[in-house]
């Protein structure tokens, strides 16, 4: 959400979040690394183009024209400098001058060595237990952000992994319209629209960067789960990886897995929607997971087929009107899983990304909670790999990513909610190896053509 240095009365009242980098002569003397030419404190650029009419509550939600309800000045970094105070480098660059390129490799979790698997699991568990060194989360909406006395900022520390969960929750939560009024649920800043892939791409990139810093390991990368196996079993649900099924309760994770000890955040939806509070850092119950166990919905008891990926990659338009979950011939809607793998919209269909979530049949299948199950990370790195292959094949053709009239939050130039510093969808609509410093080690299935008789 926001850097700890900006969660202050002064910063919130002034609307300026431009922290110092190396203040030699007192506070405010090196905002955004200005003394070393890294950046400047400038007005925030926020998308003001119209969104689609399905959101009728303009003025009622802090996520509108993000992040202007909180801050109107932030750091604009020069060249390859980046970060809340221009103290880091843009993805794919490193060094004191951010002038050296690096490329990390995201690999199939099942292809890792025993030591690498163990390292990844331990790293996730460390991220679950480690307070985020930079960001704090708001526990109240902007009108209550300074507390009942108007002088106590309502922010909390949160762990690196729970921050990853919280940002997703904040992007999908309902719009609170007041005590006694039903919250408005037909809003989602990270799903059911063109920003789905770009939002989740940045979401993963932030976690990966946070874990690299936590481990002091610049080569650390998030692996992926190739969920397009066509099977009715979860091949990564073993105790050396993401945890097998508990023998005591088929909806829980085996006690032999560290993930059985994890507790979820952002589960008190009733409170958030009726009281207008926000998810805080309090952990509740365990992760629930019952792969292929939803007997009431047989269509979600089997994972997507390898051919589904090959087919979706042949959908050449990134998105199509109405740029929503009922778009046809939209690559985004197809990989998100509201259309069938050929691109045809069908309200009964749940394919690819959506099917993988629903297959997990538990925490990972509930949108506001899903990142609490760490399989989310692996599911989304694979989804991002598909996205990156599409960008490669179609030369990152952004022409069908709408500049306006997409669902709120989904316009091309919208700052993705609630990331900081502000980052637009456009910035993530690029091939990863050339622009974002990572690549996938992956082989794509080729489409098998049947010869007509």
């Amino acid at each position: 959400q926001f850097p700890r240095q900006c969660a202050t009365v002064e910063a919130l009242r002034s609307g300026m979040c431009c922290p110092d980098l190396s203040p030699v002569s007192g506070p405010g003397t090196d905002r955004c690394g200005s003394s070393s030419g890294r950046g400047r404190c400038e007005a925030v650029t926020a998308d003001s183009r119209p969104h689609s009419p399905q959101y009728p509550h303009d003025g009622r939600d802090d996520r509108e024209v993000w992040p202007l309800r909180f801050f109107n000045r932030t750091c604009h970094c020069n060249g390859n400098f980046s970060g809340h105070n221009c103290g880091t480098c843009r993805p794919g660059w490193r060094g004191a001058a951010c002038d050296q390129r690096v490329l990390i490799v995201r690999r199939n979790l099942l292809d890792l060595s025993k030591e690498e698997k163990n390292h990844f699991v331990r790293a996730l568990d460390m991220a679950k237990r480690t307070t985020h060194p930079l960001f704090v989360i708001a526990t109240r909406r902007s009108e209550e952000i300074l507390g009942p006395d108007g002088n106590t900022p309502q922010f909390e520390n949160i762990s690196i992994y729970n921050y990853f969960v919280w940002t997703h929750y904040y992007s999908v939560k309902k719009t609170f319209l007041g005590v006694g009024q039903e919250s408005f649920g037909e809003v989602d800043f990270s799903h059911e629209g063109p920003a789905f892939l770009t939002w989740h791409r940045y979401h993963l990139l932030r976690l990966e960067k946070d874990m690299q810093e936590m481990l002091q390991e610049p080569s650390f990368s998030l692996p992926y789960w190739n969920f397009a196996t066509g099977k009715n079993v979860c091949d990564i649900c073993t105790d050396d990886l993401m945890g097998s099924r508990s023998n005591f309760d088929s909806t829980l994770i085996s006690p032999n897995s560290v993930f059985s000890q994890w507790r979820v955040v952002c589960d008190s939806l009733e409170d958030y929607d009726t009281l207008g509070t926000l998810c805080n850092s309090t952990e509740d119950g365990p992760i629930r997971r019952n792969p292929a166990g939803n007997v009431a919905r047989p269509m979600v008891q089997r994972l997507p087929e390898p051919q589904d990926v090959a087919q979706c990659l042949e959908v050449g338009l990134f998105d199509t009107p109405p740029f929503y979950s009922n778009s046809t011939n939209s690559f985004r809607n197809t990989v998100e899983g509201y259309s069938d793998p050929t691109g045809k919209y069908d309200p009964a269909v749940r394919s690819l990304h959506n099917l993988a979530h629903l297959f997990l049949n538990g925490t990972g299948g509930q949108t506001h909670l899903s990142p609490n199950d760490p399989i989310f990370v692996l599911l989304h790195t694979f989804t991002d790999a598909v996205f990156d292959e599409w960008l490669r094949r179609y030369n990152a053709d952004i022409s069908t990513f709408p500049l306006e009239n997409a669902p709120i939050g989904h316009n091309r130039q919208y700052n993705m909610v609630p990331f900081w510093p502000p980052v637009t969808n456009t910035e993530m609509f690029v091939t990863a190896p050339d622009n974002l410093g990572y690549t996938y080690e992956i082989q794509w299935p080729s489409r098998e053509f049947s010869v007509p008789e």
Partner: antibody, heavy 121, light 107 residues
Framework: QVQLVQSGAEVKKPGASVKVSCKAS????????LHWVRQAPGQGLEWMGW????????VYAQKFQGRVTMTADTSTSTVYMELSSLRSEDTAVYYC??????????????WGQGTLVTVSS | DIQMTQSPSSLSASVGDRVTITCRAS??????LAWYQQKPGKVPKLLIY???TLADGVPSRFSGSGSGTDFTLTISSLQPEDVATYYC?????????FGQGTKLEIK
């Protein structure tokens, strides 16, 4: 100025444990990761692991996993390295050293004077 | 794990000579590499970080170069006080392994 002062030499029997301390001054240990490196007599340097004193996180080299424990006491600016189930091959000088992570700097820039641990029956 | 291989293991050179020590990584480590000098009976001392940046207080006759898998430490004009063992270390992926060392002597 930056200093890392380690505890004195130790003689231990095989199977025992040793705990080496490293007291930092001239900088805030919460702002740095502290690494441990050892050197057997006449041999090269061997990286053992690191601790982040700010939160207690540790990463150990696979070779030492299960035998080494690194801890920190920020109130006294001291880090500790405990090695258990000692064997003769653990006879070495143990160094504590710090890494400045600014811009991911690839270096261990200040080193303690070293602690000789001798394992002998 | 990335292995670091130094060559030569030992070398003898005359005062004033240009001396080159190489370090090869088993995988691409970009420029996440440091060089250290350890004089007999002393503590290792940082010479070079980020493959080519001279640490504070290190004489300018020392320099580092290379990126990716092949790195070089050069002493432009060998001095008697440079007798030591030199080590490289990478910081790209865990564990942060050292090279086996290069022992430098004066002829």
């Amino acid at each position: 100025q930056v200093q890392l002062v380690q505890s004195g030499a130790e003689v231990k029997k095989p199977g025992a444990s040793v705990k080496v301390s490293c007291k930092a001054s001239g900088f805030n240990i919460k702002d740095y990761f502290l690494h441990w490196v050892r050197q057997a007599p006449g041999q090269g340097l061997e990286w053992m692991g690191w601790i982040n004193p700010d939160n207690g996180n540790t990463v150990y080299a696979q070779k030492f996993q299960g035998r080494v424990t690194m801890t920190a006491d920020t109130s006294t600016s001291t880090v500790y390295m405990e090695l258990s189930s000692l064997r003769s091959e653990d006879t070495a000088v143990y160094y504590c050293t710090r890494r400045d992570y600014t811009y991911e700097k690839a270096a261990l820039d200040y080193w303690g004077q070293g602690t000789l641990v001798t394992v002998s029956s | 794990d990335i292995q670091m291989t130094q060559s030569p293991s030992s070398l003898s050179a005359s005062v004033g000579d240009r001396v080159t020590i190489t370090c090869r990584a088993s995988g691409n480590i970009y420029n996440y590499l440091a060089w250290y000098q350890q004089k007999p009976g002393k503590v290792p001392k940082l010479l070079i970080y980020d493959a080519k940046t001279l640490a504070d207080g290190v004489p300018s006759r020392f320099s580092g170069s290379g990126s990716g898998t092949d790195f070089t430490l050069t002493i432009s004009s060998l001095q008697p006080e440079d007798v030591a063992t030199y080590y490289c270390q990478h910081f790209w992926s865990l564990p942060f392994t050292f090279g086996q060392g290069t022992k430098l002597e004066i002829k």
